[in-house]
Interface confidence: medium
C-alpha cells in the first residue's frame, strides 16, 4: 500500500476541528505581482511581507509596494505602508534583516533618476517604526550588517565606492573608491578588492586585496594579482594569478591575511573556477573545475590549516561559475554531505559521505521502492536525489533536500530509484538516520517543511492546479493525515515557517483569483493543539548515530567519536517545544585508518581504507610552500581528518621538515605588505 495508508497508521484524534480553530486566513487587499517575506528576529513572531507590483509603461516602469507586519507568526497582518511613506521598495535588495535578535530592518527605496543618492528606511524595533534616510550614494548592493555589531553597515555604490555606517545607516562615509567586492570578516574587519586601472572586469586578476580593521581609518594591502576572494570558517581564500601565464592558484590565510600559504590544489585556467562548497573552523570542501566545458570537477578536502588537500570525489557535478551544484550539507547529522557526480555516460548519480568527505557511496535503495527504467539490474539500484541542478533544469522538483540541526537524523528530498537520476516525476523520500536508509514518504512532488524540531512534518502537493489541502505527519513521515484548510482553492506559491524548525506554525501562501483580479492570501495553521501535551522523558528513546553494525565495538564511530542522541519516539504525539535542545552523549573512539585522510600525494582507491601513492608523484620528494618557506613532507600517506577526536589505536607517521629554503607563492610576502591610514 502507499505510504501512510496501511493499517498501522493511527489517526490523530479530532484533528480537523483542532486545526480549523487554529487556521487563520489573511487576504492582502488588491495586490498582485510579487511577494517577499522575512522573519525579523528569532521567536519574536514578527514577519514582514513586502508586495510589489510593476506597472510596465512604454517608456518606463513604475511600481507600487505595500508593507505588512505580523507579530503573531502570520496569523494577522497589519498594513504598515504608511510607515515607509507609501514608497516603492526595490525588491532586488530584499529586506535586509539584522543579525541575531537585533530587531533591525533596512528597506531600500526606488528613487527618481535625477536624485543625488538613494533612500533607505531603517527600523531598530522589529519594524514597529521606520526612519527615512537619504543616502549620499546610490546603492549597488544590499546593506550588509557586521556579524559582530548590527550598528555597523557596509554597502557598495553604483560608482564602486565602499561606504560604511557606524550608526545603523544614519550617517555614511565613503572609505574607499574603486571597490569590486567587500565582505565582513570577524571582529568587524572588512576585506575588499580594488582595481587600479579601468574597472572590476578589466582588472580581474590584477585586483588588490585590502583589509581594514577599524572601519576605514587605516588599511593594509594583503594581496595583489587577485582574481577573487572568499571567506569560509576561519579561512580566508584568494585566487591569485600566476606570474607566467593566465592560470590562477588558491592561497589561504588563517590570520586575516597577514601570512599566506599556497594551497596544494591544482591551478585553474581562464575558463575554470574554484568554489568553496562548505567550510567550518576545522576544514574546507573545495571544488576545482576540470579544464574544458565538462560541467564537472573534483572535490578536495583540506587539512586543519586549509593548505594540504586530498582528493575526495571525482567527476563532481558543477555546471559553470556561479552555476549549479547539488552539494548539500546534511545538517541533521554530523559529517554527512550529499552531492551528484556526472558519470562517463553523462548520467547523473547521487553520492553520500558520512565521514566529511573521506569516502563517498551511493544511497541505499529504499525498502519500499522498485528500481526504475534507468536500472540495468531491477534488483540492484540506489536512490538518487534531486537538488539544485534538477531544479535549474526545470524538472518537476519544487524543493531542494531539507534537513534541520534540531531534527536529528531527518533528511527529506525528492528522488528517483535506479542507476541514475531520472527525468520522470519524482517522489519524496525520507531518511530518519541521516541518510543511511531511506523510505518513500509521499507519491509525487511536494513542498515540505519540518516543524517542532521534527515533531511534525508538513507537505503540500506540487500542482499546477489550485490547491486547498495540506498533509501532515506526526511520526517522521510514516503516516499522513490530510486537512482541507480552505473551501476555495488557491494557487499555491510557497510554504513559510520560522527558520530553525522550532515553530508549530506554518503559513501557506498563494493567491486567489476572481474573474479579473487576484489577491495574495495566506493561511497560517498552528499545530499546537495537535501536539496537545509537552513531551516527557518517556517520549524519548536513545539512538546511536552512524550505527551500521551493532555487534562492532567501534559501531557509530565517525571522526573519532560516537554520539548517542535522545530522540522522540515515532509513536509519541507531543510537543518538543520552542526551548527544545538536542540531547547528545559523545564518547571518544580508538583511531583507525578511517580517521585519516590520504595525505598530499596519496589517494584512497575505491572501497579501500588504505592510502596509496599517486602514480605521478611516486619517488618524488613531497615538497610544498608554507608561509613562504619550502617544507619537506615525510609521510606514509595519512593525516588525521580535521575535527577528528580519536585517541590511541592506529597512529601513522607524519612529519613536516622546514627545508630552510625560500619559495614564492605569487603573493606579497608578509614583510613587503604595506599599510596606510586615512
Amino acid at each position: 500500500s502507499a505510504p501512510g495508508e496501511d493499517e498501522e497508521c493511527g489517526r490523530v484524534r479530532d484533528f480537523v476541528a483542532k486545526l480549523a480553530n487554529n487556521t487563520h486566513q489573511h487576504v492582502f487587499d488588491d495586490l498582485r505581482g510579487s511577494v517577499s517575506l522575512s522573519w525579523v528576529g528569532d521567536s519574536t513572531g514578527v514577519i514582514l511581507v513586502l508586495t510589489t507590483f510593476h506597472v510596465p509603461l512604454v517608456i518606463m516602469t513604475f511600481g507600487q509596494s505595500k508593507l505588512y507586519r505580523s507579530e503573531d507568526y502570520g496569523k494577522n497582518f497589519k498594513d504598515i505602508t504608511d510607515l515607509i511613506n507609501n514608497t516603492f521598495i526595490r525588491t532586488e535588495f530584499g529586506m535586509a534583516i539584522g543579525p541575531e535578535n537585533s530587531g533591525k530592518v533596512v528597506l531600500t527605496a526606488e528613487v527618481s533618476g535625477g536624485s543625488r543618492g538613494g533612500r533607505i528606511f531603517r527600523s531598530s524595533d522589529f519594524a514597529k517604526n521606520f526612519v527615512q534616510t537619504d543616502l549620499p550614494f546610490h546603492p549597488l548592493t544590499q546593506m550588509m550588517y557586521s556579524p559582530q555589531n548590527s550598528d555597523y553597515l557596509l554597502a557598495l555604490s553604483t560608482e564602486n565606492g565602499l561606504w560604511v555606517s557606524k550608526n545603523f545607516g544614519g550617517k555614511w562615509e565613503e572609505i574607499h573608491k574603486a571597490v569590486c567586492l567587500a565582505k565582513w570578516g570577524s571582529d568587524n574587519t572588512i576585506f575588499f578588492t580594488t582595481y587600479a586601472n579601468g574597472s572590476c572586469k578589466a582588472d580581474l586578476g590584477a585586483l588588490e586585496l585590502w583589509r581594514t580593521s577599524d572601519l576605514g581609518k587605516s588599511f593594509k594591502t594583503i594581496g595583489v594579482k587577485i582574481y577573487s576572494f572568499g571567506l569560509g570558517g576561519r579561512f580566508l581564500f584568494a585566487s591569485v594569478m600566476a606570474d607566467k601565464d593566465t592560470t590562477r592558484r588558491i592561497h589561504v590565510s588563517t590570520d586575516q591575511g597577514d601570512t599566506w600559504s599556497m594551497a596544494q590544489l591544482p591551478s585553474v585556467g581562464q575558463e575554470q573556477f574554484y568554489s568553496i562548497l562548505a567550510a567550518n573552523d576545522d576544514m574546507v570542501f573545495m571544488h576545482v573545475d576540470e579544464p574544458g566545458d565538462t560541467g564537472f570537477g573534483t572535490i578536495f578536502t583540506s587539512d586543519d590549516r586549509g593548505i594540504v588537500y586530498s582528493k575526495s570525489l571525482d567527476r563532481h557535478l558543477y555546471t559553470t561559475t556561479g552555476g549549479e551544484t547539488d552539494f548539500t550539507n546534511v545538517t541533521s547529522l554530523r559529517g554527512v554531505y550529499i552531492t551528484s557526480v556526472l558519470s562517463e555516460d553523462n548520467s547523473i548519480q547521487t553520492m553520500i559521505t558520512f565521514d566529511q568527505g573521506g569516502r563517498w557511496t551511493h544511497l541505499r535503495k529504499p525498502e519500499n521502492s522498485e528500481c526504475d527504467a534507468t536500472a540495468k539490474n531491477k534488483n540492484e539500484c540506489s536512490l538518487h536525489i534531486h537538488a539544485s541542478y534538477s531544479i535549474s533544469q526545470k524538472l518537476n522538483v519544487p524543493m531542494a533536500p531539507l534537513s534541520e540541526p534540531n531534527a536529528v537524523g531527518i533528511v527529506i528530498a525528492h528522488g528517483s530509484v535506479g542507476d541514475a537520476i531520472s527525468v520522470m516525476v519524482p517522489d519524496v523520500y525520507i531518511s530518519d538516520d541521516g541518510g543511511y536508509s531511506w523510505t518513500k514518504m509521499l507519491e509525487g512532488p511536494h513542498y515540505y517543511t519540518i516543524l517542532d524540531s521534527g515533531g511534525i512534518i508538513v507537505a503540500i502537493e506540487h500542482s499546477s492546479r489550485p490547491i486547498n489541502v495540506i498533509k501532515f505527519s506526526t511520526d517522521e513521515g510514516q503516516c499522513w493525515q490530510t486537512y482541507t484548510f480552505t473551501r476555495d482553492p488557491i494557487y499555491f506559491t510557497g510554504l513559510a515557517s520560522e527558520p530553525g524548525a522550532r515553530s508549530m506554525n506554518i503559513s501557506i501562501w498563494g493567491f486567489t483569483e476572481s474573474f479579473l483580479t487576484s489577491q495574495w492570501v495566506s493561511y497560517t495553521i498552528d499545530f499546537k493543539d495537535i501536539l496537545e501535551r509537552n513531551c516527557e522523558e518517556k517520549d524519548y528513546t536513545i539512538w546511536l548515530a552512524h550505527s551500521t553494525d551493532p555487534e562492532d565495538y567501534e559501531d557509530g564511530c565517525i571522526l573519532g567519536y560516537k554520539e548517542q542522541f535522545l530522540r522522540l519516539r515515532k509513536s509519541s504525539v507531543c510537543q518538543n517545544g520552542r526551548d527544545y535542545v538536542v540531547t547528545k552523549q559523545p564518547s571518544i573512539c580508538l583511531c583507525s585508518l578511517e580517521d585519516f585522510l590520504c595525505d598530499f600525494g596519496y589517494y584512497r582507491p575505491e572501497n579501500d581504507s588504505k592510502c596509496v601513492e599517486q602514480p605521478e608523484l611516486k619517488g618524488h620528494d613531497l615538497e610544498f610552500c608554507l608561509y613562504g618557506r619550502e617544507e619537506h613532507l615525510t609521510t606514509n600517506g595519512y593525516r588525521k581528518i580535521p575535527g577528528d577526536k580519536c585517541q590511541g589505536g592506529v597512529n601513522p607517521v607524519r612529519e613536516v621538515k622546514d627545508l630552510k629554503k625560500k619559495c614564492t607563492s605569487n603573493f606579497l610576502s608578509p614583510e613587503k605588505q604595506n599599510s596606510k591610514s586615512n
Epitope: 505581482g33 492546479r465 489550485p466 494557487y491 483569483e513 474573474f515 479579473l516
Partner: antibody, heavy 124, light 106 residues
Framework: QVQLVQSGAEVKKPGSSVKVSCKAS????????ISWVRQAPGQGLEWMGG????????NYAQKFQGRVTITADESTSTAYMELSSLRSEDTAVYYC?????????????????WGQGTTVTVSS | DIQMTQSPSTLSASVGDRVTITCRAS??????LAWYQQKPGKAPKLLIY???SLESGVPSRFSGSGSGTEFTLTISSLQPDDFATYYC????????FGGGTKVEIK
Amino acid sequence: QVQLVQSGAEVKKPGSSVKVSCKASGGTFGSYAISWVRQAPGQGLEWMGGIIPQFGTANYAQKFQGRVTITADESTSTAYMELSSLRSEDTAVYYCARQGRKTGYYYYYGMDVWGQGTTVTVSS
Amino acid sequence: DIQMTQSPSTLSASVGDRVTITCRASQSISSWLAWYQQKPGKAPKLLIYKASSLESGVPSRFSGSGSGTEFTLTISSLQPDDFATYYCQQADGHITFGGGTKVEIK
C-alpha cells in the same frame, strides 16, 4: 486555433430557465477566463458574468446576481450559463467569449475568441 | 459599477476619412480598456486591448490611446470593410461596455 462552439437556439416560456453551453476546441481551456455577454435585438453588448474554469469560482454583473449561474467542466472544456426566472426582456443573442489573462496578475487582454452566439427567445 | 459613455452614437464618414471615437469612464480604469468591432449578425471582434495594444491580425490603421477616464479609438483611413458598430469595454474589477458607435457610409 481555439474555437468556441455554442449550443443551439432555444425558445422558452417566461418564468422558466435556460442553460447554454460553450465548448472549447483546439486549445487549452482551464487557465483562461470565459465571459458571457448578451445582446438584445438592436441593442448593445451587456456583460453577464464570467468564470475561470481552473478555479470554478464565477463573478456576476450586479444586474444578474441571483438569477444567473455560470459553471465550467474542465474535463470536457465546456462552460455553461444558466439564466432562471426568464422574462421577455431576456430575449437576446447570448455569446460566450474567451478572455486572455496572466495568472497571478491583474492583466486584461480582452475577449479574443467568441462563440457564434445562441439565440434565446422568451415568449408565452 | 463603472459606466462607460461612448460618443458619438452614430458617425457618418467616407472611405479614406480619419475617424475618431471617444469613450469616457465614470471613474479611473487605468489602461484596462478594450475596443471591439461588430457587424450585423456576427459576434464582436477584438481590435485593441489594454487601451493601446493592437490585437494580432488587426490592420494597423486601427489605434487606441488614453488612460484613466478618457480613451480614443482612431481609424486612420476608413476602409469599406470598417463600416460597423464599435464598442469600448472596461475591465477594472467587473466588465461594462459602452453603448456603441455605429459608423455608417456618408
